[in-house]
């Protein structure tokens, strides 16, 4: 829905950002008051069936009391109490609680798989392309390189973790400095939080759930941006990272540990390499100049192999070439000296899917990509719905008060440091910041978590990625040991102070403040959502990169200007929402840029018309089609997944009939209901009590 | 078997070119490398370059550089080895020998050896 | 040039003493080091190759060890037939360097 399409432009509540607000949120009004609970819904599924609700055109006529969007949804009980329940029904309750709590596990599984499986696909499509990015030799002159190189590379192979064992490899085999390393793990650290936000479009179904969990999606892009903002310059003029790491580094002597233990890939992997298994040295290859790899596919075909190793002999230009002095000697005509060989004899293939199809690479990617969103998407509506069903009345007053409130005075400030430890400690159970992070998303689009509460979460889970690495360091063989933990402590002491610039005093929370920003104007027009992905993950990278190639002189060209004008623009605002009198009448507001400058209706309109052609032909075959369809046409009724879309005109007709928000009605249920989502007959039996 | 002939004794002035034969037999003639070595009366052994008769690759000692030629003809299993601008100190037994062992500089066949005689 | 010092530059001994031979390179040469028997009156005879790999038909009396610079033939147990001058040689470099010999006789 579009409930409030004015807050586009609105200021956020500072007053909601306080120390401990996350807990202390006004919470809605009782609907009950507005709505005689489940007897009237009659109404508003009759004026939601004339409606196209899901168009961004739509204005929606609101309650007079107009709610803060931000505030949680009620998410009262529609099901018979507990105690009213015979032993039958208390029975079948019972046998239905276990029951849901079962597909919630095996959704969640299936969710988690397909992240992986996303994952490979990802670097199935652009591995070889991400490889090829880092043997660019510029890298180590210029560190707005090498952050962009992060970004694209992360964003391309779908994991932080590949792209920071690349510049691993690289740094011990003296290919990447340290120093140089820096800005691309600073980069890796932006592009692993795109995942989330992909899975956060999967939510973009309904209006107010969107909002929530697209917010809660890119507080993390934001914390990460806003770090590198300030942290990079920093580390370009002082090198602190590379300091402190070296100086921790130095001053232990470790011994090789062992492996970082994979909890959760234990669960997943035998079903992830069923689908798909990839050979990742391949891309290590690549970005180490090794020509013979750009030729290798990434898709694994054996899995048992037999390495011999033989030494053998080997002609060479001059004795300077040999192995070793003692490996040399001559025949009397050329000079020889001994080898190693690897000899590698395949015995046993992989068992998954692909490996007797031997597709290219992209093909196979374009198809893992394609099923595994489907995949994805599917996980995320069901696990949405399951959770909405079960966390209705005290269950769900339990968890959120749980989950969302604070310590009682004078400790209500250590909730969101613990949140932070949560965080990091489920990251490294999960061994993986995007699954956990991910897995955060549709719980606060469905409004069991707050996000004021999803931030401590989201950076905890920041920290927790590092530590992960830094027992995967530990457990590096020597050679590459040094450079691996000292990657990997630069990495956790980037995110570190990036906590200590913008979270422990409330007013520097400004990625809160930001996703919300986005969340609202994402909400409104959706498309947003998408050129927001598009725009920052890859147009401002490739641009960056681009230019950087292009020599210093382009960069800084270029770069200055749109620096400038950000700033200016950014004063400007400051100024404008603080003290406008000091500015002059003309520039108290936007009003003196032309409309398509200051607000996003006019794209909107260009937007509406390009999809145009997909609304008319916008055939809602099933809730995953559906959802994509949603965001790309904005289909008036493409959530009613029973039949295609009606006429535009018909739509159109209805535009400005008043229609109550679905926030205003009693529960999920209900509301869902009215959005042809849930049978009707399915509501007054639904069974709540776990 | 493996057999090595050589051409029979000489005797040269100083300053003249001597050209000593060594004609191959029981063995694949392009295979093994062909080395010189030389031995003055009661004296070392002293390696004065190699042949690889297949390309025509040659290996001397810095030592006789500019004054010593390798040739091999294929057709007759024969190698020639010409040593120009004689010193009486070239007087010597001269040696063709072959290594079979593959890629090493051990020479395990060796012919009878020609001696050459340097006098005024 | 790498230089090989042979000692002792003779030698006399019984029939059935154990004789060593020693070979001095004048820088590392791993074991590119090989071993030849040559008689009076004829060409020489290669004993062995790569310090201890005895070629073929060689009695295995004679055994050969070391490495880098170090480098030694023994004949366990003298024979008649064994009188000779031996030779050590390094193909590790061009131009492939002999020693100066090694005359075994008997007493």
């Known amino acids: 829905m579009a409930p409030w399409p004015e807050l586009g432009d609105a200021q956020p509540n500072p007053d909601k950002y306080l120390e401990g607000a996350a807990g202390q949120q006004p919470t809605a009004p009782d609907k009950s008051k507005e709505t005689n609970k489940t007897d009237n819904t009659e109404a508003p599924v009759t004026k939601i069936e004339l409606l196209p609700s899901y168009s961004t055109a739509t204005l929606i006529d609101e309650p007079t009391e107009v709610d803060d969007p931000w505030n949680l949804p009620t998410l009262q009980d529609s099901g018979i109490k507990w105690s009213e329940r015979d032993t039958k029904g208390k029975i079948l309750c019972f046998f239905q609680g276990i029951g849901r709590l079962i597909l919630l596990l095996g959704f969640l599984y299936f969710f988690v798989c397909s992240l992986d499986i996303l994952s490979s696909a990802f670097q199935l499509v652009g591995g070889k392309m991400a490889g090829q990015f880092f043997s660019n030799s510029s890298i180590m002159s210029n560190p707005l390189l090498g952050l962009v190189i992060g970004v694209l590379v992360t964003v391309l192979v779908q994991s932080s973790s590949t792209s920071t064992s690349i510049v691993v490899s690289m740094v011990s085999s003296s290919l990447l400095t340290v120093r140089a390393a820096i800005p691309i793990i600073m980069g890796a650290n932006i592009g692993t939080s795109i995942t989330n936000t992909i899975v956060a479009l999967m939510q973009v179904g309904d209006r107010s759930e969107f909002r929530r969990a697209f917010a809660g999606a890119t507080v993390h892009d934001f914390f990460n941006w806003l770090s590198v903002l300030v942290l990079l310059p920093v580390e370009v003029a002082t090198h602190y990272l590379e300091i402190i790491t070296q100086l921790i580094v130095e001053s232990f002597h470790f011994k090789n540990g062992e492996d970082a233990p994979d909890l959760l890939k234990v669960i997943t992997k035998p079903f992830t390499k069923l689908i798909v298994q990839l050979d990742k040295k391949v891309i290590s290859q690549i970005a180490m100049n090794d020509e013979k790899a750009k030729n290798k596919s990434l898709v694994k075909i054996w899995c048992k192999t037999f390495t011999n190793k033989t030494q053998i002999n080997v002609t060479v230009p001059s004795t300077a070439n040999c192995t070793s002095p003692s490996l040399c000697w001559t025949d009397g005509i050329q000079n020889w000296t001994m080898k190693n060989v690897t000899y590698k004899e395949n015995i046993a293939k992989c068992q998954h899917i692909f490996v007797n199809f031997h597709l290219p690479d992209l093909a196979v990617g374009t198809i893992l990509l394609i099923l595994s969103l489907l995949v994805l998407c599917g996980c995320l509506i069901m696990i949405v719905k399951i959770l909405g069903s079960v966390l209705k009345g005290q269950v769900a007053t339990v968890i959120k008060k749980t989950i969302n409130t604070d310590f009682p005075f004078p400790f209500a400030w250590l909730t969101g440091y613990l949140a932070i430890l949560v965080g990091a400690g489920m990251t490294f159970i999960v061994q993986s910041s995007s699954v956990f992070t991910s897995a955060l998303t549709p719980l606060i689009g469905i409004g069991v978590i707050t996000i004021e509460r999803a931030y401590p979460l989201t950076l905890g889970s920041n920290i927790g990625t590092t530590t992960t690495a830094i027992l995967a360091a530990l457990a590096s063989p020597g050679n590459a040991l040094r450079s691996s933990l000292q990657i990997a402590l630069c990495h956790f002491f980037f995110n570190i102070s990036g906590i200590l610039l913008w979270y422990p005093i409330p007013f520097t929370r400004l990625p809160i403040r930001m996703a919300k920003g986005l969340g609202n104007i994402s909400a409104k027009y959706r498309w947003f959502a998408v050129f927001y992905l598009i725009i920052f993950f890859f147009l401002i990278p490739l641009t960056v990169f681009g230019l950087s190639l292009a020599g210093w002189r382009v960069l800084v060209g270029v770069g200055v200007p749109v620096v400038f004008i950000i700033i200016l623009v950014l004063c400007l605002r400051l100024l404008q929402s603080r003290c406008p009198r000091v500015l002059p009448k003309k520039l108290q507001n936007w009003n003196f840029l032309p409309l398509w400058m200051r607000s996003l209706k006019p794209w909107d309109a260009v937007v509406s018309k390009f999809t145009g052609c997909f609304q008319m032909r916008c055939c809602c075959c099933c809730r995953v089609c559906c959802r994509a369809c949603c965001l790309l046409c904005d289909c008036p009724k493409c959530c009613r997944c029973s039949k295609c879309c009606e006429d535009l005109e018909e739509a159109q007709e209805g535009q400005d009939v008043p229609v109550k928000a679905p926030e205003t009605f009693d529960n999920i249920t209900i509301s869902r209901e009215a959005q042809g989502e849930v049978p009707a007959s399915d509501s007054k039996t639904e069974c709540t009590a776990l | 078997q493996v057999q090595l002939v050589q051409s029979g004794a000489e005797v040269k002035k100083p300053g003249a070119s001597v050209k000593v034969s060594c004609k191959t037999s029981g063995y694949t003639f392009i295979t093994y490398n062909m080395h010189w070595v030389r031995q003055a009366p009661g004296q070392g052994l002293e390696w004065i370059g190699a042949?690889?008769?297949?390309?025509?690759?040659?290996s001397y000692n810095q030592k006789f550089k500019g004054r010593v030629t390798m040739t091999a003809d294929t057709s007759t299993s024969t190698v020639y080895m010409e040593l120009s601008s004689l010193r009486s100190e070239d007087t010597a037994v001269y040696y063709c020998?072959?290594?079979?062992?593959?890629?090493?500089?051990?020479?395990?066949?060796w012919g009878q050896g020609t001696l050459v005689t340097v006098s005024s | 040039d790498i230089q090989m010092t042979q000692s002792p530059s003779s030698l006399s001994t019984s029939v059935g003493d154990r004789v060593t031979i020693t070979c001095k390179a004048s820088?590392?040469?791993?074991?590119?080091v090989a071993w030849y028997q040559q008689k009076p009156g004829q060409s020489p005879k290669l004993l062995i190759y790569?310090?201890?790999t005895r070629h073929t038909g060689v009695p295995d009396r004679f055994s050969g060890s070391g490495s880098g610079t170090d480098f030694t033939l023994i004949i366990r147990s003298l024979q008649p037939e064994d009188v000779a001058t031996y030779f050590c040689q390094q193909y590790s470099r061009i131009p492939l360097t002999f020693g100066g010999g090694t005359k075994v006789e008997i007493k």
């Open positions: 020998s072959i290594s079979t062992i593959i890629t090493t500089g051990a020479v395990d066949y």
């Open positions: 790569w310090t201890s």
């Open positions: 820088q590392d040469v791993g074991t590119a």
């Open positions: 042949i690889y008769p297949g390309s025509g690759d040659t």
